[in-house]
């Protein structure tokens, strides 16, 4: 699989996961998120060459057209498969909240 | 939504369905498919900009990190979001098959 | 261009033994169904013999009116598939022609040989 | 087996006529939306050449003024106006299933 257990130990430069801290306040300027000040997004990079972990018959086929037509700008793209959610503080007020924010953390990517 | 009927119609730059025609024979060198020829099995292309049919919170998160950190590589990608199956006629010997293959065609795409 | 050249063909007596050839060019033939079909005389068109290719065990198939007579084969190193006539019979007389079915369809015919059977 | 009956078994026409020549199987030879029949033409001490494939389509360098229709047990050959060199005999074939078989065919003479 191409998660962050294999894509991380291994220099991979075909799809895979790759490490991406972001900062709320820095890189998104969103200065509600009390806590974490920021955390392990992450990000998904890198050629998809035929069969590299299609998701679906038409990543397969059009993996294989790409292959037997270089020349071509159709070819599938590294994008997140499993995601998991983040827990974050903010404040509404005085009052302070507790969210859990789905599909915030990518952990594997696959070739769509 | 990024559908063929939107993006056929429209000189759309940013991320939508693109029309690929793909012959079994000649793009794939699947001589074992007999009927159809070939077909529109399109593809996805383009830019995510911030927003754009943003497919979870991380492509949201992404889009606007890339946004404000234009240098950076990690930006989402434009993929397949609806796909249609297609029904296709071979052999098995002297015995004819149909089979219908599922998530071939690309109606619909997404920034993921 | 695809071609198929038959030969093997002519004059034999009734119980005699003939192997026709059929070479083919222009195609991947180990690909590929091959076929004999012939016309006799004044008769409409009649499969004889099928042998598929290699990716299906060489599957064959034979009509009823030539069962246990005749034998097809085919060597895909030579290109070329046979059909091993014996215990001929009057009613075999015809032109047999190779043919090459890629689908449900028989896309290709060889010129056809002729085979007679009389005393 | 599957059986195939062609009618007329034979007919006569002019040049320029409109020819139709019918295929009728004893079970379907169609499977989903694919009609596995087909038309040859057959002319003396020639060998047979493949006309339509699949019910409807041209085989490649046929003339346009060749057509086919049909679906499940009922199949049309159709000769928009007739040629000269169309005199010939035509036949059909199912690969619905094995064994692939041929219709008696229908000769197409000169009225």
């Known amino acids: 699989a191409l998660d962050t257990n294999y894509c991380f130990r291994n220099l991979e430069e075909n799809c895979c996961v790759r490490p991406l801290y972001i900062d709320f306040r820095q890189d998104l300027g969103w200065k509600w998120v009390h806590e974490p000040k920021g955390y392990y997004a992450n990000f998904c990079s890198g050629p998809c060459p035929y069969l590299r972990s299609a998701d679906t018959t038409h990543s397969t086929v059009l993996g294989l057209y790409n292959t037997l037509n270089p020349e071509a700008s159709a070819s599938p793209c590294c994008v997140p498969q499993d995601l998991e959610p983040l827990t974050i503080l903010y404040y509404v007020g005085r009052t302070p909240k507790v969210e859990q924010l789905s599909n915030m953390v990518v952990k594997s990517c696959k070739c769509s | 939504a990024l559908d063929t009927n939107y993006c056929f119609r429209n000189l759309e730059e940013n991320c939508c369905v693109r029309p690929l025609y793909i012959d079994f024979r000649q793009d794939l060198g699947w001589k074992w498919v007999h009927e159809p020829k070939g077909y529109y099995a399109n593809f996805c292309s383009g830019p995510c900009p911030y927003l754009r049919s943003a497919d979870t919170t991380h492509s949201t998160v992404l889009g606007l990190y890339n946004t404000l950190n234009p240098e950076a590589s990690a930006s989402p990608c434009c993929v397949p979001q609806d796909l249609e199956p297609l029904t296709i006629l071979y052999y098995v010997g002297r015995t004819p098959k149909v089979e219908q293959l599922s998530n071939m065609v690309v109606k619909s795409c997404k920034c993921s | 261009e695809v071609q198929l050249l038959e030969s093997g063909g002519g004059l034999v007596q009734p119980g005699g033994s003939l192997r026709l050839s059929c070479a083919a060019s222009?195609?991947?033939?180990?690909?590929?169904?091959m076929s004999w079909v012939r016309q006799a005389p004044g008769k409409g068109l009649e499969l004889v013999a099928d042998i598929v290719s290699k990716t299906y065990n060489y599957t064959t198939y034979y009509s009823d009116s030539v069962k246990d007579r005749f034998t097809i084969s085919r060597d895909d190193s030579k290109n070329t598939v046979y059909l091993q006539m014996n215990s001929l019979r009057a009613e075999d007389t015809a032109v047999y022609y190779c043919?090459?079915?890629?689908?449900?369809?028989?896309?290709?015919w060889g010129q056809g040989t002729l085979v007679t059977v009389s005393s | 087996d599957i059986q195939l009956t062609q009618s007329p078994s034979s007919l006569s026409a002019s040049v320029g006529d409109r020819v139709t020549i019918t295929c009728r199987a004893s079970q379907s030879v169609s499977i989903s939306r694919f009609n596995l029949m087909h038309w040859y033409q057959h002319k003396p001490g020639k060998q047979p050449k493949l006309l339509i494939y699949r019910a409807s389509n041209l085989a490649s360098g046929i003339p346009s003024r060749f057509s086919g229709s049909g679906s499940g047990t009922d199949f049309t050959l159709t000769i928009s106006s007739l040629q000269p060199e169309d005199f010939a005999t035509y036949y059909c074939q199912h690969s619905r299933e094995s064994p692939w078989t041929f219709g008696g065919g229908t000769k197409v003479e000169i009225k």
């Open positions: 043919t090459v079915a890629p689908g449900g369809s028989f896309d290709y």
């Open positions: 222009g195609f991947d033939f180990n690909s590929y169904g």
